[in-house]
């Protein structure tokens, strides 16, 4: 077990190991072009991410694989994501022609935790917004962030209501990150 | 070099110095009335900030000067900002009379990094939203926050699409901050 | 006073105690159904919260009581909240029948600090948005988060412009948290 310098704060009996901050698991992932995938009717598709080019990085055993951030050690993490959505209401738009209405009723982002030992994913954070834009081109971000107690082996992903509406053009518009506190 | 207590975590060969949390660079800046400044056509103007009155502070060598937060040491920082925009569509409004339409097509906030050795700024975070308000008075916030690896000497600023639409009336509505993790 | 291992970084004369991260005050609170309460005309009502079931927790002397998070030790805290609002414009809606218009002009969230020794609460963060939805059902989140220097004994609460519009249906939609940095 990691020893470090140990001390017993007066308000707590157990010894807590000290920890170098630069050694903590951290990740900031940025948007990439999404490849349309099959997903079940009532299940929001997961985004995949850039994890090492530009502003994106993973460090200290926090790994990204197959749409998931893998939690390498138990603890309290701050988790955040922004997804920028955009659409066009022009009749001739490519998306409209493909039979998908691109002025949706709503847009939703969910940060989800998956634990191998438990079959059902846990929704940690949800940002959901009705869409009533009247212009022909609309765009807007949904931002989420909060602290959660995670276990080693947990996996995190970001799900959205409609992948075709996600703005993947710039790494600063759509992103996903987590760091051990 | 800062020594502190050192230990070698099992998953990493190098020694990482321990660090007192109260000693880390931190800042929370709050809005002030903006003085209109010249800016190039395709370049968003930077906001300037209150750094020591009310809720605002800088500490541990994190300094604010001339619209910039100066990063005093390399590391991973959490950076955040909220900008509240507002406008009026009344014909008689002061801003409309000045010849600037104050029902814009969109509102945008960008948190930007500037490195002295390189003239071109790097956009770290962007929140951008189309505006389709139908009432005469409209207002809304854009919030941004994420973690980035910064280098000593980097400078951070907040740029907006239109300074005249920024709500500078209250320190809790429009703000900008960063802290070393 | 908590001793720990002490060291004097070169840029500061005072000794700063090292601190185990797992020992820091932290809380993440989640929404519950609100019981309508009397509140003064110009004062926004405070939300109450779940503090121990599901994703909610308090730890390391950070306690929740009677709508307030109690700050157990002085320091810099990151504080955040998201409130999801929703309403219906249908004439037959329950809320409309009760005589309260549920298409409000605006929606507002405020994170407020109360200090026993000071009579007036301090507004730390405000997210406020005009509402111009045109559909019959509307919903949207307001997210806030920033860092503040708090004192032992300070109390934090979340106030909203209209409790009846808060979406209390899911713990991932409306939440409130704080952690010592």
């Amino acid at each position: 077990a990691l020893k470090g310098q140990e001390f017993a704060p007066s308000h707590q009996q157990v010894y807590a190991p000290l920890r170098a901050d630069g050694d903590k698991p951290r990740a900031h992932l940025t948007v990439v072009r999404q490849t349309p995938t099959q997903h079940f009717k009532n299940q929001f598709p997961a985004l995949h991410w850039e994890h090492e080019l530009g502003l994106a990085f993973t460090k200290n055993r926090m790994n990204y694989t197959n749409k998931f951030l893998l939690i390498p050690e138990s603890g309290d993490y701050f988790i955040y994501s922004q997804v920028t959505f955009r659409g066009m209401t022009s009749e001739s738009s490519e998306i409209r022609q493909a039979g998908r209405p691109n002025k949706p009723d709503s847009i939703t982002v969910v940060i989800t935790k998956v634990t191998d030992s438990y079959p059902e994913p846990t929704q940690l954070l949800m940002g959901t917004k009705s869409v009533s834009e009247v212009g022909s081109n609309w765009f807007q971000p949904i931002y989420l962030g909060a602290m959660f107690s995670l276990q080693e082996g947990d996996k995190l992903m970001v799900n959205v209501s409609d992948i075709s509406l996600v703005d993947y053009t710039k790494e600063d518009k759509t992103f996903f990150g987590a760091f051990l506190l | 070099a800062l020594k502190g207590q050192e230990f070698a975590p099992s998953h990493q060969q190098v020694y990482a110095p321990l660090r007192a949390d109260g000693d880390k660079p931190r800042a929370h800046l709050t809005v002030v009335r903006q003085t209109p400044t010249q800016h190039f056509k395709n370049q968003f103007p930077a906001l300037h900030w209150e750094h020591e009155l009310g809720l605002a502070f800088t500490k541990n060598r994190m300094n604010y000067t001339n619209k910039f937060l100066l990063i005093p040491e390399s590391g991973d920082y959490f950076i955040y900002s909220q900008v509240t925009f507002r406008g009026m569509t009344s014909e008689s409004s002061e801003i409309r009379q000045a010849g600037r339409p104050n029902k814009p097509d969109s509102i945008t906030v960008v948190i930007t990094k500037v490195t002295d050795s390189y003239p071109e700024p790097t956009q770290l975070l962007m929140g951008t939203k189309s505006v389709s308000e139908v009432g005469s008075n409209w207002f809304q916030p854009i919030y941004l926050g994420a973690m980035f690896s910064l280098q000593e000497g980097d400078k951070l600023m907040v740029n907006v699409s239109d300074i005249s639409l920024v709500d500078y009336t209250k320190e809790d509505k429009t703000f900008f901050g960063a802290f070393l993790l | 006073a908590l001793k720990g291992q002490e060291f004097a970084p070169s840029h500061q004369q005072v000794y700063a105690p090292l601190r185990a991260d797992g020992d820091k005050p932290r809380a993440h609170l989640t929404v519950v159904r609100q019981t309508p309460t009397q509140h003064f005309k110009n004062q926004f009502p405070a939300l109450h919260w779940e503090h121990e079931l599901g994703l909610a927790f308090t730890k390391n002397r950070m306690n929740y009581t009677n709508k307030f998070l109690l700050i157990p030790e002085s320091g810099d805290y990151f504080i955040y909240s998201q409130v999801t609002f929703r309403g219906m414009t249908s004439e037959s809606s329950e809320i409309r029948q009760a005589g309260r218009p549920n298409k409000p002009d605006s929606i507002t969230v405020v994170i407020t600090k109360v200090t026993d020794s000071y009579p007036e609460p301090t507004q730390l963060l405000m997210g406020t948005k005009s509402v111009s939805e045109v559909g019959s059902n509307w919903f949207q989140p307001i997210y806030l988060g920033a860092m503040f220097s708090l004192q032992e004994g300070d109390k934090l609460m979340v106030n909203v412009s209209d409790i009846s519009l808060v979406d209390y249906t899911k713990e991932d939609k409306t939440f409130f948290g704080a952690f010592l940095l």
Partner: antibody
Framework: QVQLVQSGAEVKKPGASVKVSCKAS????????ISWVRQAPGQGLEWMGW????????HYARMLQGRVTMTTDTSTRTAYMELRSLRSDDTAVYYC?????????????????WGQGTTVTVSS | EIVLTQSPATLSLSPGERATLSCRAS??????LAWYQQKPGQAPRLLIY???NRATGIPARFSGSGSGTDFTLTISSLEPEDFAVYYC?????????FGQGTKVEIK
């Protein structure tokens, strides 16, 4: 202007190590990764590996794994490539190259700025 | 690792002619393919990134196309300075890999 300047030619004996430096100027060093590419006399280009100047993550060609180490010093805006246990077939011109990235999920870019090359000769 | 096969190995053409160079990947690389030009004694130069995007300062006579496994670099009308070796490189999966090169020589 944007440029990468490499260290000078080296002559090494088999079994020795060589460390080539690559100093960047004119751009935000930590934003763009650095790849190292070598070219043996009369041969094609061989990608050796990549390092993130942002946080030091690396990827190496399988053939060189265990013999090559790439590092960066952000304070001097310099990337380094060390190759150990040199053999005669390591004789080549070694290039560093900036990995362009356009900050967009649409594009992966390419190696848009190259150093002038460093000739490493391995001979007994 | 992904293997890139370029063809032909050598292309003999006259100035003004059209050059068509091929690069085939052993598995899909989406559109993450770059083309480089190298002249004797010089460092390579980026021509095309992401299969079809011209790099800064590259003349319009150079164009790229393709996605998945089959890619083409076209030089619409060869200029004297275009006679060189051309390499494709995949940037889809680590390790990055280069093709073996196509030499475009004067006929």
């Amino acid at each position: 202007q944007v440029q990468l300047v490499q260290s000078g030619a080296e002559v090494k004996k088999p079994g020795a190590s060589v460390k080539v430096s690559c100093k960047a100027s004119g751009y935000d060093f930590t934003y763009y990764g650095i790849s190292w590419v070598r070219q043996a006399p009369g041969q094609g280009l061989e990608w050796m590996g990549w390092i993130s100047t942002y946080n030091g993550n690396t990827h190496y060609a399988r053939m060189l794994q265990g013999r090559v180490t790439m590092t960066t010093d952000t304070s001097t805006r310099t990337a380094y490539m060390e190759l150990r246990s040199l053999r005669s077939d390591d004789t080549a011109v070694y290039y560093c190259a900036r990995e362009s990235y356009y900050g967009s999920g649409e594009y992966r870019g390419g190696m848009d700025v190259w150093g002038q090359g460093t000739t490493v000769t391995v001979s007994s | 690792e992904i293997v890139l096969t370029q063809s032909p190995a050598t292309l003999s053409l006259s100035p003004g002619e059209r050059a068509t160079l091929s690069c085939r990947a052993s598995q899909s690389v989406s559109s993450y393919l770059a083309w480089y030009q190298q002249k004797p004694g010089q460092a390579p130069r980026l021509l095309i990134y992401d299969a079809s995007n011209r790099a800064t300062g590259i003349p319009a006579r150079f164009s790229g196309s393709g996605s998945g496994t089959d890619f083409t670099l076209t030089i619409s009308s060869l200029e004297p300075e275009d006679f060189a070796v051309y390499y494709c490189q995949q940037r889809s999966n680590w390790p990055w890999t280069f093709g073996q090169g196509t030499k475009v020589e004067i006929k």
